[in-house]
Amino acid sequence: QPPPPPPDATCHQVRSFFQRLQPGLKWVPETPVPGSDLQVCLPKGPTCCSRKMEEKYQLTARLNMEQLLQSASMELKFLIIQNAAVFQEAFEIVVRHAKNYTNAMFKNNYPSLTPQAFEFVGEFFTDVSLYILGSDINVDDMVNELFDSLFPVIYTQLMNPGLPDSALDINECLRGARRDLKVFGNFPKLIMTQVSKSLQVTRIFLQALNLGIEVINTTDHLKFSKDCGRMLTRMWYCSYCQGLMMVKPCGGYCNVVMQGCMAGVVEIDKYWREYILSLEELVNGMYRIYDMENVLLGLFSTIHDSIQYVQKNAGKLTTTIGKLCAHSQQRQYRSAYYPEDLFIDKKVLKVAHVEHEETLSSRRRELIQKLKSFISFYSALPGYICSHSPVAENDTLCWNGQELVERYSQKAARNGMKNQFNLHELKMKGPEPVVSQIIDKLKHINQLLRTMSMPKGRVLDKNLDEEGFESGDCGDDEDECIGGSGDGMIKVKNQLRFLAELAYDLDVDDAPGNSQQATPKDNEISTFHNLGNVHSPLK
């Protein structure tokens, strides 16, 4: 064991180092002093530290620790923040395209309905966006409102075009008649099921990502306790009091200290692991009716089918509504020609053929793979921080908190620390209140993720027809339908590529009376590409 510096030695080196921490030298003794007032760097002989210096070291140690923690989580934080933003934007783009397809369907097939239909469709998709972002809207109510609003217009414009304008007075009765007579058949129920399942999953996916950010932010900004500050000071700075400026802490000692300081944070580990695995399970189930992209982009077709259903039953319906809403029937129902098959302007759905294919679903899977590389993030934190702060290689000739040692022995170090500081006590205190809160939030989201009514594997496919979700098979396994009947069916392979490379972004909102031609928005396309290949240090 090297002897303490001789009493006549100056504290010159310590002074110059401390000067960098705290300009002004009034706290540093000229020569070593007994240091009887020290509480952390308890001297075995004369020391170059004062009580004020010790306090400054503690403050610096805690700040260092916070910075180390922030740099440790920077990559993970960036990964989740960026993906949360990308997916939110992607979902909004899907909603906008779905709205535009639906408006295009009305414009091309039912021009007499367009002004009002655009309004109702717009309100519906606004509600869809709000729901995804967490608004307290009921999906069934949204769908009911859409069909309740559409029916009076269909009735007065399509089924009874000769009715006087005053017939709009019976709107309220027609809205109700829509449900009483089930005028759209089972289509509203079908849409409710598909939209609610897909949006619920989408919403919880975004919720989970945002909670991930909150977890990282919480642990990122943890304030370390005074006890931890003392331990860190003893590890990083007490050697300076003995003039040992170049000595590094022992690696094993660093691990012990970090585990003590991070005992509360490490408790998140179990719930963090479960969070990533539950999120993976959710993502694996996001296809077919659980994939909002697939469902929303096919809505225009289902709505078209529902209007055709009304038209096929128009004669009978007009008679019954005459009774229910008591308007005088001046004319027999006469159906104008309406095409059987869905007509969609080919300009709208021109798909570019490209080599590179990236979809929302592949993007989700990619995110999960990256997140899985951070599955041990919290349990690995103490080791990570030690490996990113100066420690002695191989635990030889290193500082153990009290003295320079040839080889670090955990037992000896613990014994030596017993009277100064109880590590066990620190662990027993339990996590900080903020950590407890974030653990509760993780438990909650994990439960939500687990209880989502998601299909297990590909079992869902067998049940589709029983539940009436999809009629007819769309061929290849990886293809999804967004089409209705006959030749009007459009097959879409990998929807997001299809979205990103739409040759025309039909935005009916922007130009209700024009030919609806618009070029794709470059920023929308780029949104879905290149997050960069982030590699995790905490594998």
């Epitope: 005053s166 007075d169 019976i170 709107n171 309220e172 009765c173 027609l174 809205r175 109700g176 008649a177 449900r179 009483d180 007579l181 019954t320 009774k323 229910l324 809403c325 008591a326 308007h327 005088s328």
Partner: antibody
């Protein structure tokens, strides 16, 4: 807010007629129908019929056909129900109710009609 | 004209759940509405179109309808829920509006 205010209680002799009024406010009168429902003491609800405020079309319950007449005055947003040839079993509280499609979403406070010799 | 059958009475302890049924042939194919009537007052619509709640009606009230039975469910029952409850449908074949026999809910 939507309100339906009915006329006051009536006491009638058997064979006489009674006319109950129902004044609507707080909504577009012609956009809804007005239905009439009665409730005999200690008994359930019985639908009597309805009238479209939009065009005056009526639909009466079979058992009251010929004895009941429903009318509206759109200028005052008022509906009327007249029941003739009263008998003791017509003693009841008579309600007017705003008719949506097949549901009655707002009700008047009720009018007690007592038929007694 | 359909007959809608309801149990004459249902008793329930406060905080518990009350279920009132309305039976009718293939009632699931019709829209069912429910009314609450407190003594000396006019009926109030509490559920329409099987399961929708008008504004102002607490979430504790819910409805369902399938097969031959429609059900009104009152969860976390309160003393103020004590009333008569009626179901109602529109019969398209006779073009008549039919009320159920009524159920008296007593809160113990």
């Amino acid at each position: 807010q939507v309100q339906l205010v009915q006329s006051g209680a009536e006491v009638k002799k058997p064979g006489a007629s009674v006319k109950v009024s129902c004044k609507a406010s707080g909504y577009t009168f012609t956009s809804y129908g007005i239905s009439w429902v009665r409730q005999t003491p200690g008994q359930g609800l019985e639908w009597m019929g309805w009238i479209s405020a939009y065009n005056g079309n009526t639909n009466y319950a079979q058992k009251l056909q010929g004895r009941v007449t429903m009318t509206t005055d759109t200028s005052t947003s008022t509906a009327y129900m007249e029941l003739s040839s009263l008998r003791s079993e017509d003693t009841a509280v008579y309600y007017c109710a705003r008719k949506g499609s097949s549901q009655f979403d707002q009700w008047g406070q009720g009018t007690l009609v007592t038929v007694s010799s | 004209q359909p007959v809608l059958t309801q149990p004459p009475s249902v008793s329930v302890a406060p905080g518990k759940t009350a279920r009132i049924t309305c039976g009718g042939n293939n009632i699931g194919s019709k829209s069912v509405h429910w009314y609450q009537q407190k003594p000396g007052q006019a009926p109030v619509l509490v559920i329409y179109y099987d399961s929708d709640r008008p504004s102002g009606i607490p979430e504790r009230f819910s409805g369902s309808n399938s097969g031959n039975t429609a059900t009104l469910t009152i969860s976390r029952v309160e003393a103020g829920d004590e009333a008569d409850y009626y179901c109602q449908v529109w019969d398209s074949s006779s073009d008549h509006y039919v009320f159920g026999t009524g159920t008296k809910v007593t809160v113990l």
